[in-house]
Amino acid sequence: FYDIETLKVIDEEWQRTQCSPRETCVEVASELGKSTNTFFKPPCVNVFRCGGCCNEESLICMNTSTSYISKQLFEISVPLTSVPELVPVKVANHTGCKCLPTAPRHPYS
Amino acid sequence: FYDIETLKVIDEEWQRTQCSPRETCVEVASELGKSTNTFFKPPCVNVFRCGGCCNEESLICMNTSTSYISKQLFEISVPLTSVPELVPVKVANHTGCKCLPTAPRHPYS
């Protein structure tokens, strides 16, 4: 009915779009909720975050397991009182993902 | 002053976070602005889109060149009048990216 090769290509495409940990660029300051007078050099780091598609539109690709990885960055505080300091920054790295439904918000929360 | 190896690692991290085309999963129906009565199987495809960090917070990682790639997908229209059709779907694929300032919105727009 349909060309088997085309179906294979479509299936491979689908496999690659599935919800899974994907390398993503995250901005460290906003990730850590730092004040505007603290910034990092480089401002971004590469980590894995859940992304991709789910079988149902109402499902969300969410992390089921997380590790924290340490990245060495320069922390710069404004006003500049000292030389930029090399600090280890722990950033969340998603190691497992799953398409999950949303739970209703508790009426009293 | 700083350990040369550490600086090398930081620089490599920074290079990898730079604004560039990155493989991304996009939902076809919303990409094409299709009505809720049309959906695709698989619902998502992999294409390259601009992403990553810029040196300044005021800059945005934007596409400077785009190609359109064709993906074979099943288009399913509801009500289902016929068997799902295998159609070529053209999706934007970013081939070049640059950190650009956001254009000021026209005050009268």
Partner: antibody, heavy 117, light 112 residues
Framework: QVQLVQSGPEVKKPGASVKVSCKAS????????MHWVRQAPGQGLEWMGY????????YYNQKFQDRVTLTVDKSTSTAYMELSSLRSEDTAVYYC??????????WGQGTLVTVSS | DIVMTQTPLSLPVTPGEPASISCRSS???????????LHWYLQKPGQSPQLLIY???NRFSGVPDRFSGSGSGTDFTLKISRVEAEDVGVYFC?????????FGGGTKVEIK
């Protein structure tokens, strides 16, 4: 066309287990989640959970969490629902339902499970 | 759990006349993605339920255009513009926004 054919009626004793099968045809089995819903005699519909046949991921209604197990056999495009520690309140028609991208769209014909001593 | 309340419980109708069923949810059914997963099913006597309307107002395959859905947030309505004899059965609303998925208690439509 999409078809979900379920196994025949079952009569079970309290405390026993039941396994209902649902054979799918007319679509790519691994591309759609399979949900299970039950309907007690003269009652409404109660959602039990779903399975993603592609990777076997399951999500259960907390009410059934400890007693229900959803599985699939990809080679035969068949989904299974096993309910253990049966009690009389579990007497119901059990449906498998394919989930389209937007909603649960195609239902099996239902399997009546009667729990009686 | 989200409670779905349907009214009326029973709806005697005259063929050719319009009919309306109401469904109210205990919480908003607007998903974080902006969509509303409120669906309507019809269970004809001795049959499995069948999908009529999905995402509030979209008619499913083969569903006649006399059926229409509307509403938002927590209040939804299914309308039949001109009831036909084949429309008898129990109508259920269902929410697919949150888990557990829940259904209304049903509205039995019968010919007068």
């Amino acid at each position: 066309q999409v078809q979900l054919v379920q196994s025949g009626p079952e009569v079970k004793k309290p405390g026993a287990s039941v396994k209902v099968s649902c054979k799918a045809s007319g679509y790519t089995f691994t591309g759609y989640n399979m949900h299970w819903v039950r309907q007690a005699p003269g009652q409404g519909l109660e959602w039990m959970g779903y399975i993603d046949p592609y990777n076997g991921d399951t999500y259960y209604n907390q009410k059934f969490q400890d007693r229900v197990t959803l599985t699939v056999d990809k080679s035969t495009s068949t989904a299974y629902m096993e309910l253990s520690s049966l009690r009389s309140e579990d007497t119901a028609v059990y449906y498998c339902i394919r989930a389209g991208y937007y909603a649960m769209d195609y239902w099996g014909q239902g399997t009546l499970v009667t729990v009686s001593s | 759990d989200i409670v779905m309340t349907q009214t009326p419980l029973s709806l005697p109708v005259t063929p050719g006349e319009p009919a309306s069923i109401s469904c109210r949810s205990s919480q908003s059914l607007v998903h974080i993605n902006g969509n509303t997963y409120l669906h309507w099913y019809l269970q004809k006597p001795g049959q499995s339920p069948q999908l009529l309307i999905y995402k509030v107002s979209n008619r499913f395959s083969g569903v006649p255009d006399r059926f229409s859905g509307s509403g938002s947030g927590t209040d939804f309505t299914l309308k039949i513009s001109r009831v036909e004899a084949e429309d008898v059965g129990v109508y259920f609303c269902s929410q697919g926004t949150h888990v557990p998925r829940t259904f209304g208690g049903g509205t039995k439509v019968e010919i007068k």
